[in-house]
């Protein structure tokens, strides 16, 4: 037969200090093999894979097959108790002599093996008639996890030999498997809360609870699904679970209304250009939905505008935006609203910013060159171009001047200052055509070239040139 | 380590010419400009011209343009300065400094944070 | 061209002592990007310069904090809390803000 009992515990030999099997003579002292895993028998002692106690008769392989069935004695079946005791089961078998070829027992769970440390030992008794083999597991502390068919396995002769089932039944609290989960909803709209416990013991009813009130009087059977048909404030919802061992609560869950966003905060300028301002923001509270756009709002600051606002939407994520299309050198007001399903929060504090200047937008007029032979430098004078406000300070000028001969290029810029308008640049290649071009600047940018003025660079003395204003591009008058 | 290593001294004829030369290491040459300040015996010191060798611009003090050429050799990192038809007012130390990278030399900036050594030009007959 | 005036050409102090050197613009060096781009170099006796502060009171790496620099518009100053030996040379102020850049005309710092 098998025992199963529970113990408080956990040396191993007070572990396996019950009863014992039939059929032991109590003046045989038994052999026992402490498992790990597996479990193995001792090593053979006279050639065959079971301790020798008598010398066992060869049995051919016809007798083989007369030999009597070999089973597991009957054990307990079913184990029930409480969550974090002590547990220990066994199985035994009688093996006669006759038979030579035996091997380990094995526990298995719910089909598969149990490998690994576990806490089984093997106990061999042998006698005249053969030997009585017990093998005992033990579980400390048990979890749910724990729960199931417990049985041992074992090869006579080449044939598997299965134990009936041992039936562990951990029984506890309730255990949760699915609790409500916060949600985000919109004023007076339904919404569903799932709650789902197990024991065992079975069956586990469910209580609800909002705001620490029981909502359903009457228990339900888990796994229950609580329909709200609408909220107009946050509520905390919980659901209790009870079996007969007790009672667990869930954790609570906040259910939170859906509302506009709060204003955007902290909007600062990162970077302006003559023609765009790079805004970002700190996005307000999201009012418990997803922030899904935002519109930068934008005025001109100067009391003379008409006060027409600039719409630019864009996504709510970067929480930043580059304006364009400004004007140079002009002020503005810009603010940030942000919208979720329910709607567009109230705008963030307006900010002053500045756009800088541009750069200039037409080009220097006039321009003529001279060659200075007793020099050997070309003389550039123009006339300031008209520059707009917004086009910035003049700070100075850009001269390219190119060179060209049979064989040879060579470009080369030069910058002046704002302060004349004329510049002298060194001969560069005799025998060439010199083109000049001249581009305003400010600290807004560069301006465009004029049109080029071309001048031939004699070999020696000889000079063919012409001052020219307003040149046809690529244009060389003679003089 | 930002380095500016400077030719050496230089005894030249009035009216001739000279090329000063100034070779870079310990940073990106094209990344910053480059600058040449003269400074007279027991006197101060004067801006010469600048080259930014990343779009390749120069710019000069009006008093010695059309006389000095800036220009610069990015495969070796080194800048040049030659000044022509020398006279005896140009005997000084020249000195190279680097200053910061700006899309115009005309532009405020030009923080002159590392300087050559000096190279000592004599003017003479 | 902006002219960069340093009163002062030569100032004798003792070591461990104080020391003031002013720098005075013909006109206002702040610029329009509200930066005021004022500049201190020292040159030490057969030396090349080396930039001591940048934009009024910024110090360069490596510079003692005895080091400050003030000023704002056209008026400016560089003190040194406790002169010391190696403090002594030539100490120029230059403007970054108007084009062409311009030097004052040095202070020499030496021994009393």
């Known amino acids: 037969g098998g025992t199963a009992e529970k113990w408080e515990e956990t040396e191993l030999d007070q572990l396996f200090s019950g009863p014992l099997p039939g059929r032991l003579p109590v003046n045989h002292r038994p052999f026992s093999a402490p498992h790990s895993s597996r479990d193995q028998l001792p090593p053979p002692q006279t050639g065959r894979s079971h301790p020798a106690h008598t010398a066992a008769p060869q049995v051919t392989s016809t007798a083989s097959k007369l030999l009597p069935p070999v089973a597991f004695n009957h054990t307990i079946g079913h184990i029930v108790l409480s969550e974090h005791k002590n547990v220990k089961f066994n199985c035994s078998i009688n093996i006669p002599n006759t038979y030579q070829e035996t091997a380990g027992i094995s526990w298995w769970k719910d089909g598969k093996e149990l490998l690994g440390a576990h806490h089984s030992i093997t106990q061999f008794y042998p006698d005249e008639e053969g030997v009585s083999i017990i093998a005992l597991f033990s579980i400390a502390s048990v979890q749910r996890s724990d729960n199931g068919s417990y049985f041992c396995k074992m090869k006579v002769n080449n044939r598997e030999i299965v134990s009936d089932p041992i039936y562990v039944e951990v029984q506890g609290l309730p255990y949760f498997i699915k609790q409500p989960e916060s949600v985000n909803v919109t004023r007076n709209t339904a919404f569903n809360l799932t709650c789902q416990a197990v024991g065992p013991p079975e069956p586990v009813n469910i209580f609800w609870v909002q705001n620490s009130s029981r909502v359903n009087e009457k228990p339900e059977r888990s796994p229950s699904v609580l329909t709200v048909p609408g909220l107009t404030e946050t509520a905390v919802f919980s659901c209790e679970a009870h079996n007969d061992k007790g009672l667990t609560v869930s954790k609570g869950v906040h259910i939170n209304i859906k509302v506009i966003p709060s204003p955007p905060t902290e909007v600062h300028i990162l970077n302006s250009t003559a023609h765009s301002i790079l805004v970002s923001w700190v996005p307000g509270f999201d009012g418990y939905s997803p922030l899904q756009n935002c519109s930068i709002q934008v005025k001109e600051a100067d009391r003379l505008s008409n006060g027409s606002v600039m719409v630019f939407n864009t996504s709510a994520s970067p929480h930043l935006y580059e304006i364009q299309q400004l004007q140079a050198l002009a002020n503005y007001s810009i603010a940030v609203s942000c919208r979720n399903e329910i709607g567009w929060s109230a705008v963030s504090p307006w900010i002053l910013a500045s756009t800088t200047e541009g750069a200039p937008s037409v080009a220097p007029l006039n321009i003529t060159v001279f060659l200075n032979e007793s020099n050997n430098i070309l003389d550039i004078r123009w006339t300031k171009p008209p520059i707009k406000r917004q086009d910035g300070e003049l700070v100075g000028y850009r001269i390219s001047h190119v060179w060209e001969s049979a064989g040879t290029y060579k470009e080369l810029s030069e910058e002046v200052s704002q302060n004349g308008s004329w510049a002298q640049i060194p001969v560069q290649i005799h025998n060439a055509t010199c083109t000049v071009r001249i581009a305003a600047i400010t600290k807004g940018g560069i301006g465009p070239f004029s049109e080029p003025v071309n001048i031939i660079i004699p070999e020696h003395s000889k000079v063919d040139y012409a001052p020219s204003s307003t040149p046809a591009p690529g244009n060389t008058d003679s003089m | 380590e930002v380095q500016l290593q400077q030719s050496g001294p230089e005894l030249v004829k009035p009216g001739a010419s000279v090329k000063i030369s100034c070779k870079t290491s310990?940073?990106?040459?094209?990344?910053?400009?480059m600058h040449w300040v003269k400074q007279s015996h027991g006197k101060s010191l004067e801006w010469l011209g600048g080259?930014?060798?990343?779009?390749?611009?120069?710019s000069y003090n009006q008093r010695f343009q059309g006389r000095a050429t800036l220009t610069v050799d990015k495969s070796s990192s080194t800048a040049y300065m030659e000044l022509r038809s020398l006279t005896s007012d140009d005997s000084a130390v020249y000195y190279c400094?680097?200053?910061?990278?700006?899309?115009?030399?005309?532009?405020?900036?030009?923080?002159?944070?590392?300087w050559g050594q000096g190279t000592t030009l004599t003017v003479s007959s | 061209d902006v002219v960069m005036t340093q009163s002062s050409l030569t100032l004798s102090v003792t070591i461990g002592q104080p020391a003031s050197i002013s720098c005075k613009s013909s006109q206002s060096l702040l610029d329009s990007d509200g930066k005021t781009y004022l500049n201190w170099l020292l040159q030490r006796p057969g030396q090349s310069p080396k930039r001591l502060i940048y934009?009024?009171?910024k110090l360069d790496s490596g510079v003692p904090d005895r080091f400050t620099g003030s000023g704002s518009g056209t008026d400016f100053t560089l003190k040194i809390s406790r002169v010391e030996a190696e403090d002594l040379g030539v100490y120029y102020c230059?403007?970054?803000?108007?084009?062409?850049?311009?030097f004052g005309g040095g202070t020499k710092l030496e021994i009393k």
């Open positions: 230059w403007q970054g803000t108007h084009f062409p850049w311009t």
């Open positions: 080259f930014n060798p990343n779009n390749v611009i120069t």
């Open positions: 310990g940073y990106t040459f094209t990344e910053y400009t």
């Open positions: 934009l009024v009171s």
């Open positions: 400094t680097r200053g910061d990278l700006l899309w115009s030399l005309l532009l405020p900036g030009n923080y002159f944070d590392y």
